[in-house]
Interface confidence: low
Amino acid sequence: ADSFSLNDALAGSGNPNPQGYPGAWGNQPGAGGYPGAAYPGAYPGQAPPGAYPGQAPPGAYPGQAPPSAYPGPTAPGAYPGPTAPGAYPGQPAPGAFPGQPGAPGAYPQCSGGYPAAGPYGVPAGPLTVPYDLPLPGGVMPRMLITIMGTVKPNANRIVLDFRRGNDVAFHFNPRFNENNRRVIVCNTKQDNNWGKEERQSAFPFESGKPFKIQVLVEADHFKVAVNDAHLLQYNHRMKNLREISQLGISGDITLTSANHAMI
């Protein structure tokens, strides 16, 4: 998998001294812009959320209903770059915004390095799934959340829910078999209703194989990298980041570690 450059990411995020962070990899091609518009705006091809057909009952945990339970919107965002092997996750590639699903060139190549910031949270070791990782004080720009584990054989789904009370600010849901296709669905649950889905056709997870998910919080979006490759970006729909105080991790995985660090 391509990795991304932490230096580039920092440079692209307005960090005045990106060179202060070592790069773990060589100079790979920089990330290009992502075609297509990112949220806000309408996502083409979306299903109207109106009655959200098949929606899980109020209070139901997302991902437990059949795949049709989530409204079917579209445009995927591009996400953060990965991290250095064994280190803490890298930052997202600097590109512009997310590409449309499957759009050529939508997923930039990146190279990355990781900061020497220490993680907070859970020690490495098997964790019970579903697992709730507290995010004291909420999330904030430059916070990096790293989740490591292994996908179970014959997996159906993985779910990450960045929660704000009963709401889900960022629902990241790789689905291994939605109508015989693999897709990543991102969404927000607000006022007990799911919004417009953003769907991503790039699918870096494999049943039975280990994974590393890194989520970098930026001022206006979450960036996600998987196995040190930039995957997608999801624009904030809830602005009160400091109130997003819990990360729920569930699905068909064994969880080795989950932590967060400021980079």
Epitope: G165, N166, N192, K239
Partner: antibody, heavy 117, light 110 residues
Framework: EVQLVESGGSLVKPGGSLRLSCAAS????????MNWVRQAPGKGLEWISN????????YYADFVKGRFTISRDNAKNSLYLQMNSLRAEDTAVYYC??????????WGRGTLVTVSS | QSVLTQPASVSGSPGQSITISCAGT?????????VAWYQQHPGKAPKLMIY???YRPSGVSNRFSGSKSGNTASLTISGLQAEDEADYYC??????????FGGGTKLEIK
């Protein structure tokens, strides 16, 4: 049937206090953020306050901060608005409203609050 | 004074289409917040017609549509009918749960 019914509106003197109540039925009350919205006679709508399902996150419009307090009792399926230091300009119909993904989909019929000496 | 600016009134004949604008700023309408539209008949409570910029709740006629461009949102009503005569209000978030309304637009059917 999903329903919201406000009560507690009355005539009150300037500087006085009043507590409005809203009884919710037909839906799982604790799952929804709730709002108070008001409308002065012949005027437009004004958002007052919002409270989430667990009463953890509460927001107010600037013009009522420090004077009005929103609260809820999920066990009683009830929403409340405690109004203190009332002014003539607070005269309005007060609506209890359910949040719906950035909109407000269920409205009560409203209760009239008149502030006058 | 309302934060969002709407025309005080618009008019149209039965069968025609009309558009009501709602001008805001990058901090409300132009942000990635949701715009909603409400219809209010005299003496009645408002009714949600459009939410999340352009989506209709179930039960709302498809003659009503919403859109947003830059810092301005719009409500379009096609095939005007007598029962559409009412006041229309736009609303936008300025933060996760804070909201502001427009001053309202009176729609007159000629």
């Amino acid at each position: 049937e999903v329903q919201l019914v406000e009560s507690g509106g009355s005539l009150v003197k300037p500087g006085g206090s009043l507590r409005l109540s809203c009884a919710a039925s037909g839906f799982t009350f604790s799952n929804y953020n709730m709002n108070w919205v008001r409308q002065a006679p012949g005027k437009g709508l004004e958002w007052i306050s919002n409270i989430d399902g667990s009463s953890r996150y509460i927001y107010y419009a600037d013009f009522v901060k420090g004077r009005f307090t929103i609260s809820r009792d999920n066990a009683k399926n009830s929403l409340y608005l405690q109004m203190n230091s009332l002014r003539a300009e607070d005269t309005a119909v007060y609506y209890c409203v359910r949040s719906y993904y950035g909109g407000m989909d269920v409205w009560g019929r409203g209760t009239l609050v008149t502030v006058s000496s | 004074q309302s934060v969002l600016t709407q025309p005080a009134s618009v008019s149209g004949s039965p069968g025609q289409s009309i558009t009501i604008s709602c001008a805001g700023t990058s901090s409300d309408v132009g942000g990635y917040y949701n715009v909603a539209w409400y219809q209010q008949h005299p003496g009645k409570a408002p009714k949600l017609m459009i939410y999340y910029d352009s989506y209709r709740p179930s039960g709302v006629s498809n003659r009503f549509s919403g859109s947003k461009s830059g810092n301005t949102a719009s409500l379009t009503i096609s095939g005007l009918q007598a029962e559409d005569e009412a006041d229309y209000y736009c609303s936008s978030s300025t933060g996760y749960s804070t909201r502001v309304f427009g001053g309202g637009t009176k729609l007159e059917i000629k």
